[in-house]
Structure formats: C-alpha cells, structure tokens
Interface confidence: low
C-alpha cells in the first residue's frame, strides 16, 4: 500500500495536548523511533507527568482515505460498556504549507488530530519542490511556529553590505519562482531556498534538508545545504550552506528583516529577530482579545462585533463581502453557514460562499502587525477552504464611532485580504516579557 501523503513521510512530527501535558510523536508512513512504544508505533503518546509512553496507533493497522488517516491498536478500551480498541484519527485538510498536526481532543479510546497541509490538497497548486517542518516545541511544550513566515511566492532579501550580490531566502521551503514572474528570482534554480544573485546569474546556495530546531527557548535554527556535488567556483572548494537563526526579541517590537551576520567560503550565517520565533501563545488568541501577562499587550476587538443582524459590507468588484467579526451572529445572506465573512456574487446573489467561519478564528499580533484570521470556509476547487485575513491599523479618528470599516484589498488562491482602520486596533503595551 503506497504511503497516502508522501511529502509528510520523511519526518516524525509532534503534537501536544497542553491541558494534560502530553507529547505525541507521529510518523504517518513508518514508525516512530521510540523504544517504549514498540517497534511499529505510528503514534506514540508521552505522558510527561508520569514519564510513561503508550502506543496509541500502530503503523501496521493503518487505514486511509484522501482526508482521514486512522491508526488502530490491539489495546482494548472501555467506552460505554463496549469493547473498543485505542486508536488515533488524523483528519487532513488542504493547506498552503506542510503545516503541523494539531491535537484536537482525546477520549478514552480515540486521539483526534487535525492537519492542514499541502499534502491533502486536490491539486498541487501549493506544493513545494522541497519543504521541511517549520515548527518546534520547546522544553516547556510551548509551540514555536514559523509557518506564517513561509512565502508561497517570492523571497526575503537578506540585509548585507555587499553591493555586488543579493542573497534571497525563503523559510522552510524552496523559493517558488514560477509565481514571481519578471523578478531577478526567475534565474534561481528549482529547489533552492537560498539563492545568491550576482548580476544576471543566480546560484543555489542552500536547500532545506532538516526541520526547524530549537537551540534555546527563544532561538530557533534552520539549516540549508546545497545538495548536489558540483562546487561553485567562487566558494574556494567548499560546499555552500546557510544557517538562519530566528530570535524571539526580549520585548514587543516592529518586525525586522533577516541580516547577514557572517560569510566565509559560501557559508552564510543569518540572524532574524522576529516575534514569530516566540511561542505561539505569546502571539495568538482564539478570542478577539489579547491581554494578560503572557502577551505583553492589551488588544480588544470585541466592540467591532455587530448585533441585530447587521454586518459590515466591503466591495470586491465582482463580489460583495459581508463581515461580522468577534461574535457568533449569523450573517443573513450566508444561509446558516456560521460565516464570519460571507462572499456574495453581485451578478448572481444565490452564489454565496463562506470565506471563513466564526468558530475558526485566530487573532495574531506579531512584529507589529495585528491580524484577524477566519478559516474553514467553503472549499475551492483545489480543496483549500476559503479563508479571510483582516489586517488592522490603529486609527484614533476612524469613522463609524471609531469602529471604522473593512476594505477588501484582494484575493490570492482563495484567501481574501482586508484592511481595517479602527481605534480598537490601537495596541497598549506592557513591558515585562
């Protein structure tokens, strides 16, 4: 039986149940390399409190569909008096990166995970030539996730002092030059995640091989190497390599660009100070507010919620978008889809799509950007569920009683982008990170 998601096969992935202090190791194609879980465990549960291990999914007892992977075991469990077996269930959804398995919940018998990943898409529109896991858990089981930094097209220009060369990088995956026509990146070879441009020539100086690593609580490292043997003539016989160190800043700050800190014989060392290197709970909330000791800021967007069935309306040329954020009020047009953002075709108002649902909400404040994301909308042909990304700007003189109004700015691959100037996006900082 062929592996169902080959892009995910090369790695053992991790997920965490934070409430119960449980670390799961998952290998969807083979077995995890943990002796205590036995030789054929595909999902190994590590109970950190008791320092015990249990296999909750056997690689031999795998069943797969396009969107669901189940690993059974031979271990009995008692659920409502019936004799079940312990199993793990992973639901796959189309995503724009390899993504991360997320622990959802566990019963006595079943451990549930959800995974938004390119591997589950119906088309290969988001697939990379080469991509590696882009998240890590620190020793306190806090998740550091660089997936939001991954560029699906184009690349980041590294800040260095050499006027003759430009070093471009992507995070955790190769640079997609196909989607970035007309730029100097067009010359970059397929597969490169670090591309050195000199004049009209471009050189592969590194491809992703291993996933993200944590070296200290607030320092993450990503290494790229040039895979094929051929040496570059300007490298003095050395093989090129790139090391990117992502640093979580000691206090809240605006984003910075990656900086070249050392260069010798085509070995490039880059440091990138970014809040995306901090643990995810520092950056994100599932509610419409971010506050408390952990986040160093006070943000509350809940006053933007509309009551009484009214919605914000944003004009998108062919479509009208109805938005109702930070609440669970149904949008009238959206046919009980539980949509926070609803897309209606102007020429045919019966064509209605949920562009993100209110129970799939993430508020993120990172590198000075405040973003509200709604995902899990109606599927596009690629299998990707429509989502909306609302970028907020502080405006103390915003109209509509300070609330302002969302403005549609564009769509890329079934992700809808809005900007919203409002006084409620003005962030209050605390200083004790």
């Amino acid at each position: 039986q062929a592996a169902p998601f080959p892009e995910l096969c090369s790695y053992t992935w991790e997920a965490v149940d934070t409430k119960n202090n449980v670390l799961y190791k998952i290998n969807i194609c083979g077995s995890v390399d943990i002796v205590q879980c036995g030789p054929s465990s595909a999902v190994c549960m590590h109970l950190l409190k008791t320092r015990t291990y249990h296999s909750v999914g056997d690689s031999v007892l795998r069943s797969a569909t396009r969107s669901l992977l189940e690993f059974n075991t031979t271990v009995s469990c008692d659920q409502q008096g019936t004799n079940h077996r312990v199993q793990s269930s992973i639901a796959f959804l189309c995503g724009k990166t390899l993504g991360t398995p997320e622990f959802v919940t566990a019963t006595e018998c079943v451990h549930y995970f959800e995974w938004r990943t390119t591997a589950a898409c119906k088309k290969d529109i988001f697939k990379a030539n080469k991509e590696v896991p882009c998240y890590v858990f620190d020793e306190e089981l806090r998740k550091h996730d660089l997936n939001p930094l991954i560029k699906l097209s184009g690349a980041y220009l590294v800040d260095d002092s050499d006027p003759d060369t430009s070093l471009f990088i992507n995070v955790c995956r190769d640079i997609d030059t196909l989607r970035d026509p007309g730029s100097q990146l067009r010359a970059c070879p397929p597969g490169t995640a670090a591309c050195l441009v000199r004049g009209h020539q471009a050189f592969d100086v590194g491809q992703p091989r291993d996933g993200l690593k944590v070296v200290r609580k607030d320092r993450l490292v990503l290494s790229y190497v040039r895979e094929e043997a051929g040496k570059l003539d300007f490298c003095d016989g050395h093989s090129p390599a790139v090391t990117i160190t992502f640093v979580c800043p000691s206090e809240r700050r605006e984003g910075t660009i990656p900086k070249l800190t050392a260069k010798s014989n085509c070995r490039y060392e880059i440091e990138w100070i970014t809040e995306y290197a901090c643990h995810r709970d520092y950056l994100e909330s599932k509610t419409c507010s971010l506050s408390g000791e952990q986040q160093d800021v006070s943000i509350d967007l809940t006053p933007l919620a509309q009551s009484g069935g009214s919605s914000y309306i944003s004009d998108g040329k062919e479509y009208l978008f109805y938005l109702n954020v930070c609440g669970e009020t149904e949008i009238q047009f959206c046919n009980k889809k539980q949509a926070a953002v609803c897309q209606v075709k102007k020429s045919d108002t019966s064509q209605v799509k949920a562009a993100g649902r209110y129970h799939n909400q993430t508020l993120r404040y990172s590198d000075g950007d405040l973003t509200l994301i709604y995902f899990g909308g109606d599927e596009c042909s690629s299998g990707f569920q429509r989502m909306s990304v609302i970028n907020f700007e502080c405006n103390k003189t915003a109209g509509n009683d300070g609330k302002g109004t969302p403005v549609f700015t564009g769509e890329v691959d079934c992700t809808y982008f809005f900007t919203w100037d409002t006084e409620y996006a003005c962030v209050h900082h605390h200083h004790h990170h």
């Epitope: 062929a2 169902p4 080959p6 119906k122 290969d124 196909l178």
Partner: nanobody
Framework: QVQLQESGGGLVQPGGSLRLSCAAS????????MDWYRQAPGKQREWVAT???????TYADSVKGRFTISRDNTKNTVYLRMNSLKPEDTAVYYC??????????WGQGTQVTVSS
Amino acid sequence: QVQLQESGGGLVQPGGSLRLSCAASGIIFSDNRMDWYRQAPGKQREWVATLASYGWKTYADSVKGRFTISRDNTKNTVYLRMNSLKPEDTAVYYCKASSPVLNDIWGQGTQVTVSS
C-alpha cells in the same frame, strides 16, 4: 498500475524538431504537476520544464524559447515540443508526475540524439 510512458525520441539533425509524448495511466492526470528532465551521457539528470496542474509553465534557461511543454488532459498525455535542436540537447528525456497523494512517478525515458 500507475505508470508513465515516454515516446517520440529519435535521431534528428541540428536545427530540427521533435515532439516527445508522455502518456500517463493509473493516476488522476489533471491533478498532477508534470516535469520533463534529461540526462546526457556521463552527466547528472537535469530539469528541463514544468507544467503545473493549475497551468504555470516554466523552463530551464538552456531550452527557453526553443522548447514548449503542453498537456492534453483528455488523452492523459503531456508533450514536449523541441525546436531548433542542438547537439547539446542529446540525452535521454524523462517525464515525471508529482501528485498530492502518490509518490513521484518517473517514466522509463526516451533517447534523443541530435547529430549531423
């Protein structure tokens, strides 16, 4: 049985043309990204062209403007039209399919020789 079968190779004079075909069976062809690669004697396999399932086409610098990749989903076939052939285009040409749910699939290859 999932497989790819190349055809259309042969001996051609410099400046001549060929059209290579790659027929796929056992896969949902339209969901796959299709690539052409080539391997000259004693050299590493090199990428030639890509046609993504959503329509993007891209080419190696060495063939840009001379080669064209296309597909016919009704025939489950991808083509590589090669014009203005040069001796350095001599190689075995392989097609590859990359799908969301299967391992990459390679064909057996077809020989192209450009010589006067």
